[in-house]
Amino acid sequence: IVGGTNSSWGEWPWQVSLQVKLTAQRHLCGGSLIGHQWVLTAAHCFDGLPLQDVWRIYSGILNLSDITKDTPFSQIKEIIIHQNYKVSEGNHDIALIKLQAPLNYTEFQKPICLPSKGDTSTIYTNCWVTGWGFSKEKGEIQNILQKVNIPLVTNEECQKRYQDYKITQRMVCAGYKEGGKDACKGDSGGPLVCKHNGMWRLVGITSWGEGCARREQPGVYTKVAEYMDWILEKTQSSDGKAQMQSPA
């Protein structure tokens, strides 16, 4: 996160850190807890690393430097990448992770509410992006979870800024005209949340941007409301009940 500040314990209890353990262990992406056994993240996080065994998911943490070999983590039971996502394109950048074991909810580890299907009428004015990603383009992963308040921009405005790319209705953009505040490398897959009527909702999944926090280059996020049918379909349990935080 560029231009952000330190978060507090329990401020973003749905934020998780997706880490890979090969020879060393490192944070690669963020994610959002949406149910006892489900995390929502970006599909591009798994490019070149589709093996679920190498991933460790840390929830209920604030400081990455607090993680030791004894820190509990979740393992992946299943990675569900959107069927229309292609490595060679930038669309449908969304994936679900089913955890091997369900998580108990606590003050520091609980899910984010999802938006209603096709939510286009709600005007969100209080939106935040969080993550442990770089604090500048040529930066490094941060220890303490960062937060930054960023306004949404219209898709029309966003398209003007990214004429080389197609900004679809299944994307949402956020940023300041002057830049300075944005997500960055390592924040991918993490949440763009907005508070509306006293409730936080997961509006976007951190996907891409041209550099980080550059002037007139907003961040681009996967629009969660556009994928509610897909999320519901994939997270339905065998008894037909959705094991996730229902939309408000």
Partner: antibody
Framework: EVQLLESGGGLVQPGGSLRLSCAAS????????MIWVRQAPGKGLEWVSS????????TYADSVKGRFTISRDNSKNTLYLQMNSLRAEDTAVYYC??????????????????WGQGTLVTVSS | DIQMTQSPGTLSLSPGERATLSCRTS???????LAWYQQTPGQAPRLLIY???SRATGIPDRFSGTGYGTDFTLTISRLEPEDYGTYYC?????????FGQGTRVEIK
């Protein structure tokens, strides 16, 4: 299976014209930026021109600007390169390629993931 | 224009040896826009590495890419007979998109 097949090459005199075609199959052509790259005999690769998915934006190397025109017909899944005022130095194998533009580490990527087999253009009197 | 300079021009190595190919750019290049291609005689180029370090589909893990900014490296950990040919680095950071002049890897 992604396939790109160039055609239209041949021998042409200096000052002459030629139109290259590249037939694409196995993917959604209208989603991808496409390019032409050439390789003079015994030399390296040179990017020639690119065109946006819709065809609305085109870019050219200085060496061909004003002489070559890139275009596409998404209904026919075909890419074109119209070459006018040809010179001896335009002699090369011309390849069409697909531009992949995915996402990695919260940034867009750009690379040429599929190439045609090439068509030889010889400009000589 | 961004100039791409590859070294060495030619690399003579035996099968099983390690090959290290260098690519230097005249300006900063975002790693996500740096790719490597392999070309064997009479064939079209083939994508090996994109984003400076990501292997393309079907490329064996003996190929690896590293680098940042202006210095990039392609490494072939153990040369196989099919690896001989010419290797090009290429940037799509800004137009004109440019290629290096190539490094030829030949059998010693």
């Amino acid at each position: 299976e992604v396939q790109l097949l160039e055609s239209g090459g041949g021998l042409v005199q200096p000052g002459g014209s030629l139109r290259l075609s590249c037939a694409a199959s196995g993917f959604t052509f209208s989603v991808y930026m496409m390019i032409w790259v050439r390789q003079a005999p015994g030399k390296g690769l040179e990017w020639v021109s690119s065109i946006s998915p819709s065809g609305g934006q085109t870019t050219y190397a200085d060496s061909v600007k004003g002489r070559f025109t890139i275009s596409r017909d998404n209904s026919k899944n075909t890419l074109y390169l119209q070459m006018n005022s040809l010179r001896a130095e335009d002699t090369a194998v011309y390849y069409c390629a697909r531009v992949a533009r995915g996402i990695a580490a919260r940034s867009r990527t750009s690379y040429f993931d599929y190439w045609g087999q090439g068509t030889l253009v010889t400009v000589s009197s | 224009d961004i100039q791409m300079t590859q070294s060495p021009g030619t690399l003579s190595l035996s099968p099983g040896e390690r090959a290290t190919l260098s690519c230097r750019t005249s300006q900063f290049v975002n790693s996500n826009y740096l790719a490597w291609y392999q070309q064997t005689p009479g064939q079209a180029p083939r994508l090996l590495i994109y984003g400076a370090s990501s292997r393309a589909t079907g490329i064996p893990d003996r190929f690896s890419g590293t680098g940042y900014g202006t210095d990039f490296t392609l490494t072939i950990s153990r040369l196989e007979p099919e690896d001989y040919g010419t290797y090009y680095c290429q940037q799509s950071s800004r137009t004109p998109w440019t290629f290096g002049q190539g490094t030829r890897v030949e059998i010693k």
